[in-house]
Interface confidence: low
């Protein structure tokens, strides 16, 4: 929008409301919002609530994603977790006593479960409940992968912490490849840095649910806290749309060619579900913070200007280069709602929901 | 650009090319295009065109990175390599027989001289040359940190390799610490990676310029294979500049608040310095693609308009829900260019110059 | 000269209702959010209640949600804070503040003096 | 609610030191956060927004910094007009909450 024109704030507002209507609805590829009728009164189930604490702490730890999305990633994912193999099992028998490293056991059918075909699943993290610690401590996750060998997978620098804190890796490259795989049991293993040096490689940090359980603690209420793996991956109704529909092509150089870039600002825009869209059927959240961008960005090159007295405005106004650079976001993050399909509530992950910063472009 | 409007192309291209003009002018922070008076004839020195290919072979391998940029990385950097510190250093002496891993040594007085101050420098990477190798191995890098102490800093998994290959990591923060403190030799280690219950420990990559010459192996042409810093820094006098010149603020939620997001075509546009832009001064490369965005980017949501026909539009026109979206880069990548100053050659690297893919946005 | 000035504090008993007022200068009323913000004796400060510039959206603080109800009359450039159901713990320094929303951010750049509500029986 | 701790509670100092006050937000807030400054009998007074920038009109001896969940309001250099009681305040949620408060006295 030109400087030169007033601008109502009010007007644009409402279109990028409107624009945010249209949004979820074809994130979750419904026509309309679902059908209230049927919804349970009363909170949600404590189950749920912590699957959408889960997906939105993961929002809340990780900066936007801004790569581009191919189609699939564009429609909401639906997030479940899937509790490690309990400790009473079998299978941790033989890794009592390594004092090295702790396990975590997997079972493929209660994944494939959720996750009924691997190019469905989007993200699967490994999530581990890590308790206090006055130590720091270097620390390795691994793969389990054939009977008696273990793949890195990654590592991370554990500081002392006076609070319980949840760890989180990224393992859907893994998970992927144990649903490509038959049933059966696969698992990780969490192990001390071993140095080339030293002599002391014992693990210190301790994991709820797994590490012997210290005197006083209590215990995990429903298994809450113990490992577990969460998936976002997008539902095989979804998916089955995904192929027979139209594609989104990916905008790069192998399809086609165009371009703009430039400076400007994000201002405030709070949705509330029910006031500004007159939607009661998404429980969680009430509402977030979707903003938007406005602001000039004007064209500031021409031959007859001055060279000496334009320079120093490109870095603000046209640091792209653009023959007609506009407004718009640079970081998005996502959005995690809980809304009931019927009588069954879902925990859905909607990409690019929240813009965090804009510049002309 | 209104879809309904004929779009003038050859006018875009030429907008496009004038400030192209301006962008690159103010990236280097010139009022007017250097003057080609007393430039050396003939071509460009042996180092000078290995620190070209080594800043070009770096925009090759690596995606554009989307992250906002602080005011200072929108100017062009200044490219400088500093070798390792010779092996036939004393220093060397007492690390020869350790099977498990290989030390690199730097003089900090070298790295000071091309980045006189620590917040100039914008990132630094170390660079090793891996000579061919048919085992897999997994590999750690390491700083020095007190007399007997090292700091880990990050890990590479290597596969096998029929061709000598370079190794980059990036060690910006640590070399911004070595400028901090006092001149001396610093150092890092490259490590096998020390498995707890393993024995065999040792390290089997071989690099080049430091592992022994194996026979038949050519020495080093003027040393310029062997590991060395790739400093990218903001040159001192362009710093004042900065300093005193009025800040350009960061856009985003710390300092405004404004919104727009689609999809459209990136179009192809080749600039050629000398044809395009009459220069004649910028002596590698001859000319590069910059590309530009363009393409209707419809407001498709209104209150009247059938939900499930504009749903399936969202995807392609209108993902962010805009209030009024526009075409714009989504991917943009550095260009590396090499040019005289009086009779020096400089070699610097202007971010954000190519446009590899669209959005709307 | 920029300045709000508060008015209707006052003494009044448990359970009962009171209106305060805050007449704005200097300034265009209706391009700016408005706020209440109250200090009780000796204490830190509160967040009251909001509402924007058009008066469209409002903003309550659970402790008084459903007892007070902020509006604005922008013909008049004022804004009111109508209170019901008093409280002993509604005893404070009312505060009407401006909201400076320009950069995205709220922040109360404009405060008036502050007019006292004693709720005592 | 986002609860916003600040400390010290209190805090002596003299004429030129420097002093850091800190304030701690329950969650992310970003930038959202705001500084004020009240003394007694006087409504409070804007001196920084945004967790950084400045209010025009206000000495450059204040500044601010941090993200997230922690942040700090500086005086560089304690003038005698600087004695008073320090507020932070949230924006990023309603309910907005302010601090606990600061009060810097003479040492």
């Known amino acids: 929008l030109s400087t030169s024109k007033t601008i109502d704030m009010e007007l644009v507002k409402r279109k990028r409301i409107e624009a945010i209507r249209g949004q979820i609805l074809s994130k979750l590829r419904l026509a309309s919002p679902p059908s209230q009728g049927e919804v349970p009164p009363g909170p949600l189930p404590e189950a749920v609530l912590a699957l959408y604490n889960s997906t939105r702490d993961r929002v809340a730890g990780e900066s936007a994603d801004p790569e581009p999305e191919p189609e699939a990633d564009y429609y909401a994912k639906e997030v479940t977790r899937v509790l490690m193999v309990d400790r009473n099992n079998a299978i941790y028998e033989k890794t009592k006593d390594i004092s090295h490293s702790i396990y975590m056991f997997f079972n493929t059918s209660d994944i494939r479960e959720a996750v009924p075909e691997p190019p469905l699943l989007s993200r699967a993290e490994l999530r581990l409940q890590r308790l206090k610690s006055s130590v720091e401590q270097h620390v390795e996750l691994y793969q389990k992968y054939s009977n008696n060998s273990w793949r890195y997978l990654g590592n991370r620098l554990l500081t002392p912490t006076d609070t319980p804190e949840w760890l989180s890796f990224d393992v859907t490259g893994v998970v992927r490849q144990w649903l490509n795989q038959g049933d059966g049991i696969q698992g990780f293993r969490f192990s001390a840095h071993c140095s080339c040096d030293s002599k002391d490689n014992k693990l210190h940090v301790e994991i709820n649910g797994i590490s012997p359980k210290r005197r006083g603690d209590l215990g995990t209420i429903h298994d809450m806290n113990r490992p577990f793996l969460l998936l976002m991956a997008t539902p095989l109704e979804r998916a089955q749309h995904l192929h027979s529909s139209r594609h989104r092509r990916a905008l790069d150089t192998n399809y086609c060619f165009s371009s703009t870039e430039k400076n400007c600002c994000v201002r405030q825009l709070y949705i509330d579900f029910r006031k500004d869209l007159g939607w009661k059927w998404i429980h969680e959240p009430k509402g977030y913070h979707a903003n938007f961008c406005l602001g000039p960005c004007p064209y500031i090159w021409s031959l007859d200007t001055q060279y000496s007295k334009v320079l120093a405005l490109y870095n603000q106004h046209n640091p792209g280069a653009s023959a007609s650079p506009c407004c718009v976001p640079q970081a998005l993050e996502p959005l995690p709602i809980v809304y009931y399909v019927g009588r069954k509530p879902k925990v859905e992950q909607l990409s690019n929901m929240i813009v965090r910063s804009c510049k002309c472009s | 650009l209104s879809t309904s409007k004929t779009i003038d192309m050859e006018l875009v291209k030429r907008k496009r090319i004038e400030a192209i003009r301006g962008q690159i002018l103010s990236k280097l922070r010139l009022a007017s295009p250097p003057s080609q008076g007393e430039v050396p004839p003939g071509p460009l020195p042996e180092a000078v065109l290995a620190l070209y290919n080594s800043t070009r072979d770096r925009v090759a391998g690596e995606s554009a990175d989307p992250e906002p940029e602080p005011e200072a990385d929108y100017y062009a950097k200044e490219v400088t390599r500093v070798l390792m510190v010779d092996r036939n250093n004393a220093i060397y002496e007492k690390t020869k027989d350790i099977s498990h891993s290989i030390y690199m040594f730097f003089n900090t007085s070298d790295i000071r001289e091309a980045v006189p101050e620590p917040p100039l420098l914008s990132r630094a990477e170390l660079r090793l040359q891996r000579l061919k190798s048919s085992v897999e191995q997994h590999v750690e890098l390491y700083q020095k940190y007190s007399n007997n102490s090292w700091r880990y800093l990050g890990n590479r998994l290597l596969t096998p390799t029929d061709t000598p290959e370079w190794l980059s990591f990036d060690v910006t923060g640590v070399v911004r610490q070595w400028l901090n403190q006092g001149d001396g030799i610093q150092g890092f280690r490259f490590s096998a990676h020390c498995s707890c219950d393993s024995k065999d420990n040792k390290l089997h990559v071989e690099i080049n310029g430091i592992s022994p010459k194996r026979r038949g192996d050519l020495g080093t042409i003027h040393d310029m294979n062997r590991p060395f810093l790739l400093l990218m820094a903001t040159p001192l006098e362009r710093a004042q500049h900065l300093h005193s010149s009025r800040h350009r603020r960061a856009l985003d939620t710390n300092y405004c608040f404004s919104s727009t997001e689609k999809n459209c075509c990136v179009r192809q546009l080749y600039i050629d310095f000398r044809k395009d832009l009459g220069w004649k001064w910028i002596h590698e490369p001859k000319g590069y693609h910059a590309n530009f965005c363009l393409g209707p980017c419809p407001y498709i949501w209104s209150l009247d308009t059938q939900y499930s026909k504009v749903l399936a539009l969202y995807n392609q026109h209108n993902p962010g829900a805009s209030a009024s979206p526009c075409c714009v880069p989504q991917a943009l990548e550095p260009l590396p260019i090499v040019y005289y100053v009086g009779r020096k050659p400089k070699v610097e690297q202007l971010s954000n110059m190519i446009v590899r893919s669209c959005k709307c946005s | 000269e920029v300045q709000l000035l508060e008015s209707g504090g006052g003494l009044v008993q448990p359970g009962g209702s009171l209106r305060l007022s805050c007449a704005a200068s200097?300034?265009?009323?209706?391009?700016?959010?408005m706020s209440w913000v109250r200090q009780a004796p000796g204490k830190g400060l509160e967040w009251v209640s909001a509402?924007?510039?058009?008066?469209?959206?409002?903003y309550y603080a659970d402790s008084v949600k459903g007892r007070f109800t902020i509006s604005r009359d922008n013909s008049k450039n004022t804004l009111y804070l109508q209170m019901n159901s008093l409280r002993a713990e509604d005893t404070a320094v009312y505060y009407c503040a401006r909201v400076d929303s320009s950069g995205g951010y709220w922040y109360f750049d404009l405060w008036g003096r502050g007019t006292l509500v004693t709720v005592s029986s | 609610d986002i609860q916003m701790t600040q400390s010290p509670s209190s805090l002596s100092a003299s004429v030129g030191d420097r002093v850091t006050i800190t304030c701690r937000a329950s969650?992310?807030?970003?930038?959202?956060l705001n500084w004020y400054q009240q003394k007694p009998g006087k409504a409070p007074k804007l001196l920084i927004y945004?967790?950084?920038s400045l209010q025009s009109g206000v000495p450059s001896r204040f500044s601010g910094s941090g993200s997230g969940t922690d942040f700090t309001l500086t005086i560089s250099s304690l003038q005698p007009e600087d004695f008073a009681t320090y507020y932070c305040?949230?924006?990023?949620?309603?309910?907005?909450?302010f601090g606990g408060g600061t009060k810097l006295e003479i040492k």
């Open positions: 305040q949230q924006s990023y949620s309603t309910p907005l909450t």
């Open positions: 509402i924007s510039g058009s008066g469209g959206s409002t």
């Open positions: 969650q992310s807030i970003s930038s959202y």
């Open positions: 945004a967790a950084s």
């Open positions: 200097g300034f265009t009323f209706s391009s700016y959010a």
